[in-house]
């Protein structure tokens, strides 16, 4: 058993049918010695008396808010949560496996640049009685500071018969140098509590590996005289690290017909313009990627050919 | 992804082309190592990230873009002293800091070159003959060093009398390649920045 926060405790259970569970001793936070009784949640049934209460915690019915009283007055509370260990592996019931970029990916994180700011998000099908708390650091043995905000519900989607909820959090490394070569990864830890179930999820990454630039901005077409060709031009996104000559991007320009089946013409360039043939009803899209470190491509910025 | 090959203009900063080749070569070598050594811990998540140049050179600090010198988090110690002549500076008015930067890059390359050559000698003794260093990568390191053209003492190749532990050597190769790829990215950024200056 360990303390998650004041008066909230996590009991770790080896979770299998007929498991013996864990013996837990609760102590009433009071100078009083006599006349103390214990109850669980809203029930008025007295579970025991005395300054301490010993319970065998086996399943969720044994978890909850234990309260000690004296003469009708509440003295203190202890909330017990359960953390299930199933065959040596901590349970992951609360969050959905996003399966990207690989199986067992519960937290996904992205950064728009090298400033040390990043966003993480996760998915769940649970809509109520759910709380999250996020901590982060650079490295784990001698951790350096990363400050995270509160996790907020950022999107709701309908997936088949189920509703899916997306939560996200923004974090900022306290003293980040955009040009630094990372040798210690960022660690992100999310505590999730659903009703009386506790779970924790972690992710470890280098900022350089989660970079995903914003799409190029100001995408424009300039027709070339007496030709089906057009000059496409764009600019670096505002959110990208500066100077651009140091943090350079490379671009992919795509000409896509109306039908998804039509052949796509693609050109790669380090410049912020390209000459392409504009077909009728086609659209031109441009996306960006770090020129020197192949992390994710940005989403496409698009304009119609007409 | 293959990086687009930039053909250098005659007047272009001479080292840019070499640094792009270097990054391409080390990335290819790392990819090859990860595929060949699939049963070894060779991914970014599994290895310890060590920097053999730590406390010996300070390339990131010495080569910091001017725009980032206002960022206090970027300003670590700049105490290492370097040699300050080199042909990449040809026909350019260059500051002392730029010479320091290029000299630091040269020292990095020299250190990695020695490590890779020593390691290759060990890998050639492996009866499994599983993996060797790409000669192209070693050649590209050499080319960039020549382009930088700094006069510096030659570091003797480390020779080891004891029987090599091939498992450890292959893991060290992965560690070195990951670190060298990160340094090659920095070098490429620096060359791109200097070319635009």
């Amino acid at each position: 058993i360990w303390e998650l926060k004041k008066d909230v405790y996590v009991v770790e259970l080896d979770w299998y049918p007929d498991a013996p569970g864990e013996m837990v001793v609760l102590t009433c936070d009071t100078p009083e010695e006599d006349g103390i009784t214990w109850t669980l949640d809203q029930s008025s049934e007295v579970l025991g008396s005395g300054k301490t209460l010993t319970i065998q915690v086996k399943e969720f019915g044994d978890a909850g808010q234990y309260t000690c009283h004296k003469g009708g007055e509440v003295l203190s509370h202890s909330l017990l949560l359960l953390h299930k260990k199933e065959d040596g592996i901590w349970s992951t019931d609360i969050l959905k496996d996003q399966k990207e970029p690989k199986n067992k990916t519960f937290l996904r994180c992205e950064a728009k640049n090298y400033s040390g700011r990043f966003t993480c998000w996760w998915l769940t099908t649970i809509s109520t009685d759910l709380t999250f708390s996020v901590k982060s650091s650079r490295g784990s043995s001698d951790p350096q500071g990363v400050t995270c905000g509160a996790a907020t519900l950022s999107a709701e989607r309908v997936r088949g018969d189920n509703k899916e909820y997306e939560y996200s959090v923004e974090c900022q490394e306290d003293s980040a140098c955009p040009a630094a070569e990372e040798s210690l990864p960022i660690e992100v830890m999310v505590d999730a509590v659903h009703k009386l179930k506790y779970e924790n999820y972690t992710s470890s990454f280098f900022i350089r590996d989660i970079i995903k630039p914003d799409p190029p901005k100001n995408l424009q077409l300039k027709p070339l005289k007496n030709s089906r060709q057009v000059e496409v031009s764009w600019e670096y996104p505002d959110t990208w690290s500066t100077p651009h000559s140091y943090f350079s991007l490379t671009f992919c320009v795509q000409v896509q017909g109306k039908s998804k089946r039509e052949k796509k013409d693609r050109v790669f360039t380090d410049k912020t313009s390209a000459t392409v043939i504009c077909r009728k009803n086609a659209s031109i899209s441009v996306r960006a990627q770090d020129r020197y470190y192949s992390s994710s491509w940005s989403e496409w910025a698009s304009v119609p050919c007409s | 992804r293959n990086l687009p090959v930039a053909t250098p203009d005659p007047g272009m900063f001479p080292c840019l082309h070499h640094s792009q080749n270097l990054l391409r070569a080390v990335s290819n070598m790392l990819q090859k190592a990860r595929q060949t050594l699939e049963f070894y811990p060779c991914t970014s998540e599994e290895i310890d990230h060590e920097d053999i140049t730590k406390d010996k050179t300070s390339t990131v600090e010495a080569c910091l873009p001017l725009e980032l010198t206002k960022n206090e988090s970027c300003l670590n110690s700049r105490e290492t002293s370097f040699i300050t002549n080199g042909s990449c500076l040809a026909s350019r008015k260059t500051s002392f800091m730029m010479a320091l930067c290029l000299s630091s890059i040269y020292e990095d390359l020299k250190m990695y070159q020695v490590e890779f050559k020593t390691m290759n000698a060990k890998l050639l003794m492996d009866p499994k003959r599983q993996i060797f260093l790409d000669q192209n990568m070693l050649a590209v390191i050499d080319e960039l060093m020549q382009a930088l053209n700094f006069n510096s003492e030659t570091v003797p190749q480390k020779s080891s009398l004891e029987e090599p532990d091939f498992y450890k050597t292959k893991i060290k190769l992965c560690i070195l390649l990951h670190a060298f790829r990160i340094r090659a990215v920095t070098i490429d950024r620096v060359m791109s920045y200097l070319n635009a200056s």
Partner: antibody, heavy 115, light 112 residues
Framework: QVQLVQSGGGVVQPGRSLRLSCAAS????????MHWVRQAPGKGLEWVAF????????YYADSVKGRFTISRDNSKNTLYLQMKSLRAEDTAVYYC????????WGQGTMVTVSS | SYVLTQPPSVSGTPGQRVTISCSGG????????VKWYQQLPGTAPKLLIY???QRPSGVPDRFSGSKSGTSASLAITGVQAEDEADYYC????????????FGTGTKVTVLG
């Protein structure tokens, strides 16, 4: 004590269907994940499928994906394995099993796929 | 499709020490715990070892398990005639959990 009693096995022709059941008693069935494991005659153990305690997630071996469906009825304390498009290579003893560090197995039920 | 490799058979005379190896990889045994089962002919597997080296109550102490890196092993010290059976190791793979990963199985023969 924990008990898992299996039923539903038998002889079936290739291409046909069969449903296996596993009735649980002696524990809170709705709190635990469950597996199906099979063993072809003279061969080793092969995992078939898993279902979460609440039925929210199901996982299958590639060899049965799209043909077999694992399900559970927590009100009846019963686990099921619906097998469709059966093949000769599905011939095996099928076991249900609880998920956890200490596990309990059903007695096994024989499924023979033969024309 | 078996990722955990066991020797097909091992044998010993009563009282001898018999060991069975189970070889896996970094993503399975390297990251997760190992179980060992004993299966007597015509019966369901019986749990002998969980959590690499833990014995459930009722399992004789002549059975012991260990794990090192990407391999595990089961030792029977002072093998007895009733130990003649098939033995399977089991673990999980990081990418496919909760799919059970079984070893290829080892037939233990008690000679004499």
């Amino acid at each position: 004590q924990v008990q898992l009693v299996q039923s539903g096995g038998g002889v079936v022709q290739p291409g046909r269907s069969l449903r296996l059941s596993c009735a649980a008693s002696g524990f809170t069935f709705s709190s635990y994940g469950m597996h199906w494991v099979r063993q072809a005659p003279g061969k080793g153990l092969e995992w078939v499928a898993f279902i979460r305690y609440d039925g929210s997630n199901k996982y299958y071996a590639d060899s049965v994906k799209g043909r077999f469906t694992i399900s559970r009825d927590n009100s009846k304390n019963t686990l099921y394995l619906q097998m469709k498009s059966l093949r000769a290579e599905d011939t095996a003893v099928y076991y249900c099993k609880t998920h956890g560090s200490h596990d309990n197995w059903g007695q096994g039920t024989m499924v023979t796929v033969s024309s | 499709s078996y990722v955990l490799t066991q020797p097909p058979s091992v044998s010993g005379t009563p009282g001898q020490r018999v060991t069975i190896s189970c070889s896996g990889g970094r993503s399975n045994i390297g990251r997760n715990t190992v179980k060992w089962y004993q299966q007597l002919p015509g019966t369901a597997p019986k749990l002998l070892i969980y959590g690499n080296d833990q014995r459930p109550s009722g399992v004789p102490d002549r059975f012991s398990g260990s794990k090192s890196g990407t391999s595990a092993s089961l030792a029977i010290t002072g093998v007895q005639a009733e130990d003649e059976a098939d033995y399977y190791c089991q673990s999980y793979d990081r990418g496919t959990h909760p799919a059970l990963l079984f070893g290829t199985g080892t037939k233990v023969t008690v000679l004499g």
